[in-house]
């Protein structure tokens, strides 16, 4: 007997489609061997149709796929569009040769069924509105009309044109007559339920005369549509309920033995388990909805449903859509730290993973909102301008061909505290979601930044200088400026680097900038921070006021600017990867017309597309040491 | 909630042929999957036979043990469910479990993926 199970017998109908799972024993051999589905020929050979190895026979080009689940120790075959030649036998078997392992399945595809002349049928699905017409002769125009439901051999009346209606029908069922219509008359019944599938009867008149027609309702649960989705990637579950609920809340469920719970719905009810890597959008106006999962664990495996009603919870009679998601664990989506700690006023830099072969895709940021249905406003992106509030702490580093962009984010409130999405233009499974966790500050920052007030006088020589402990005595230090589209790094000069590190004196471990000579373009935020190779580590910010020789009235109050990065811990900000703009005296003259476009253009990421990367900064106005 | 009764069950002799029903109340189903399980004193349920109805398709599994001999079957999604057992053995004596899971999920030999059990139906085959 063979160790492979799996159904010995599947049977369906033409156009449809089966879904054939094959169970193996837990091995780690099992597991990472090819798994194959093949037809059994009359000459004893087994044809492969469909392998793990990729191989797809042409028969099954466009309608199949064969899936592995090694956490399950399962594989599946899905086969679409089928046809009555599919009925044979078959074998879903793992090894190298369609020899090995394997399991007997036979597969039989049937025509759709016919029935007898004189019965209509109706095909509706769950929740929907059926109208059955029932035609009469013209002696029989005056005469009672009703719809019954055949139980064994009985018939019970569900309408009648005496205002009768069977309580199980109550405000569903109603009989009608259209315009001037004198042979035919109609049963509508609404929001139908899996009881009322069954044979129906129609009749208007008594006795022998009476003019009878048959209905054969079939009222389908959805069949579920199958999705297959990697560990840590997304999912987007479409949902569309037709115009009729476009005015009742939505909500997506998922199935638990008798119950469905809900995970969201338009009425801000939210399963905590989603809380911060979930949105419902609305689509239009006719209904349409979409709910959007991000970092897509294990236990997310399931059967989910979407339905409208006023409530937001499921109610039977209301139409649905349902889905099966699987997850494999077999992700190509590495695993990145799904929790985030800083402290106030200091910084974070978090590390996005994005589709290696996408480098060129835009990268954005957003913020998850718990408002309403979750929203994630983009806070920075490759091509969008940071977003008020963010200004001088908040900056995306790319590291093309990486795989990965970094964001850094400093002067950290708690405020900073919630949920943040990594994410691109390209590939859309690749959604990461971080949590960002602020705690009060119980000691001094790692970088200290002096002077604290920070004033430059124009046409003069100004230092500033970031003092770091030993612990970061090997790593690379930096100055950089911010700007809205990045933090350039800037020439700066270590003056902790001539120690020995042997003798690391805590209080003479510097690095310094210099602008001379000052020019009005240099007042800003400047970023001193510390990383190895692309690894970016902790930061600190400062805004430098650049006031005239002559007058005495600074530009920007700089202890007001500097108060926000130093002196108020609940307004700091986090460790941020940041771009640089216009600061610059000489850049190419080029980038200065992308730079314009990118303060003209929107606040929205996809509306963001100005090309301008202003590069290295050895431009900075004046020369640093 | 969903009731399941069988019935069916008696006494017989080697060689000899029974016809299990599993009767479904409550809740009517489309992506259902129906089984059967028996179990001898002292010992673990062991997984017997199991159809599954996907709209408009099914799917049927049994044990090797019974292969050939015992067919489950299932007249439509709301309908009765029913386990003809041909060429009985005494080691087929034990007490017949009907037992169902909506929607299909799991294993279909592992009695811990279903969520609705009937109360059992003893059936004796002597020799």
């Known amino acids: 007997q063979s160790p492979i199970f799996g159904p010995q017998d599947v049977s369906s109908i033409e156009g449809n489609s089966v879904s054939i799972t094959c169970y193996y024993p837990d091995t780690s051999v099992n597991r990472h061997t090819r798994k194959y589905w093949c037809r059994q020929g009359a000459n004893g050979y087994c044809a492969t149709l469909i392998s793990s190895n990729g191989y797809l026979s042409k028969e099954y080009s466009g309608r199949a796929s064969l899936i592995n689940f090694p956490e399950n120790s399962t594989f599946v075959i899905n086969i679409a569009h089928l046809t009555q030649e599919d009925t044979g036998s078959y074998k879903c078997g793992l090894g190298t040769t369609n020899r090995g392992l394997f399991f007997d399945v036979s597969l039989e595809v049937s025509q759709v069924p016919e029935f007898p002349n004189d019965t209509h049928v109706y095909t509706k699905d769950i929740g929907r509105t059926v109208t059955i017409e029932c035609r009469f002769k013209e002696g029989n125009a005056h005469s009672k009309k009703s719809l019954c439901k055949k139980r064994g051999e009985a018939c019970e009346v569900v309408i009648d044109s005496t205002e009768y209606v069977d309580p199980s029908y109550k405000d569903r069922a109603i009989l009608f007559m259209k315009g001037t219509s004198r042979d035919i008359f109609y049963v509508n019944i609404s929001h139908l339920i899996p009881s009322d599938a069954g044979l129906y009867v129609c009749q208007a008149g008594e006795g022998p005369s009476a003019d009878k027609n048959n209905a054969d309702l079939q009222v389908l649960e959805p069949e579920p549509e199958l999705l297959y989705k990697d560990l840590r990637s997304s999912v987007t579950f479409e949902c569309d309920l037709g115009r009729e609920v476009a005015n009742d809340a939505k909500y997506l469920c998922r199935k638990n033995k008798e119950t469905c719970d809900v995970i969201i719905n338009t009425l801000g009810k939210r399963d905590p388990a989603f809380e911060g890597r979930i949105l419902l959008t609305p689509r239009d106006d006719n209904g349409r909805f979409s709910v959007l999962i991000t970092g897509l664990r294990k236990e997310d495996a399931g059967h989910y449903q979407c339905g409208a009603h006023s409530s937001g919870l499921p109610q039977e009679g209301w139409p649905v859509q349902a889905w099966q998601l699987f997850v494999n664990e077999e992700s190509t989506i590495p695993n990145s730290r799904s929790v985030v700690k800083g402290v106030t006023g200091g910084s974070v830099a978090i590390v996005c993973p994005y589709n290696p072969k996408e480098s060129s895709s835009l990268k954005y940021w957003c913020h998850w909102e718990a408002d309403e249905n979750g929203r994630c406003p983009v806070l920075v992106g490759t091509q969008a301008l940071v977003q008020e509030g963010y200004e001088g702490r908040l900056a995306l580093f790319d590291q093309p061909g990486s795989g990965a962009y970094t964001v850094i984010l400093n002067q950290l409130t708690t405020q900073d505290s919630g949920f943040y999405w990594c994410l691109t233009d390209g590939d859309s499974r690749w959604r990461t979601t971080i949590e960002l966790q602020v705690a009060e500050a119980t000691k001094k920052p790692d970088l200290e930044v002096t002077p604290q007030n920070a004033t430059a006088v124009i046409g003069e020589t100004f230092t500033i200088s970031c003092h770091y402990p030993c612990k970061f005595y090997s790593q690379e230090k930096y100055w950089c400026k911010w700007s809205n589209d990045g933090c350039h790094i800037l020439p700066s000069h270590d003056e902790g680097a001539r120690q020995s590190s042997v003798s690391c004196d805590q209080s003479s471990q510097i690095v310094s900038m210099t602008l001379n000579p000052v020019k009005k373009e240099d007042e800003g935020w400047y970023w001193c921070g510390v990383k190895e190779g692309q690894v970016y580590g902790e930061t600190t910010a400062i805004y430098v006021a650049v006031e005239e020789r002559t007058r005495g009235s600074p530009h920007i109050n700089p202890t007001d600017a500097n108060a926000r990065a130093k002196d108020a811990p609940e307004e700091e900000a986090m460790e941020s990867s940041v771009r640089e703009d216009e600061n610059k005296a000489n850049l190419d003259p080029r980038l200065f017309a992308d730079e314009r476009e990118i303060q003209n253009a929107g606040d929205q990421a996809q509306e963001n597309r100005a090309s301008g990367n202003a590069g290295s900064a050895g431009g900075q106005s004046g020369s640093s040491k | 909630e969903v009731q399941l009764v069988e019935s069916g069950g008696g006494l017989v002799q080697t060689g000899e042929s029974l016809r299990l029903s599993c009767a479904a109340s409550?809740?009517?189903?489309?992506?259902?999957?129906m089984a059967w399980f028996r179990q001898v004193p002292g010992k673990e349920r062991e997984f017997v036979a199991a159809?599954?109805?996907?709209?408009?398709?099914?799917?049927?599994y049994s044990a090797d043990s019974v292969k050939g001999r015992f067919t489950i079957s299932r007249t439509s999604p709301k309908g009765e469910t029913y386990l003809q057992m041909n060429g009985l053995k005494p080691e087929d004596t034990a007490v017949y479990y009907c037992?169902?899971?909506?929607?299909?999920?799991?294993?279909?030999?592992?009695?811990?993926?279903?969520?609705?059990w009937g109360q059992g139906t003893q059936v004796t085959v002597s020799s």
């Open positions: 037992a169902a899971v909506s929607p299909v999920v799991g294993d279909p030999r592992n009695s811990d993926t279903y969520n609705y």
């Open positions: 409550g809740r009517a189903f489309s992506d259902l999957r």
């Open positions: 159809v599954e109805w996907r709209g408009s398709s099914r799917y049927y």
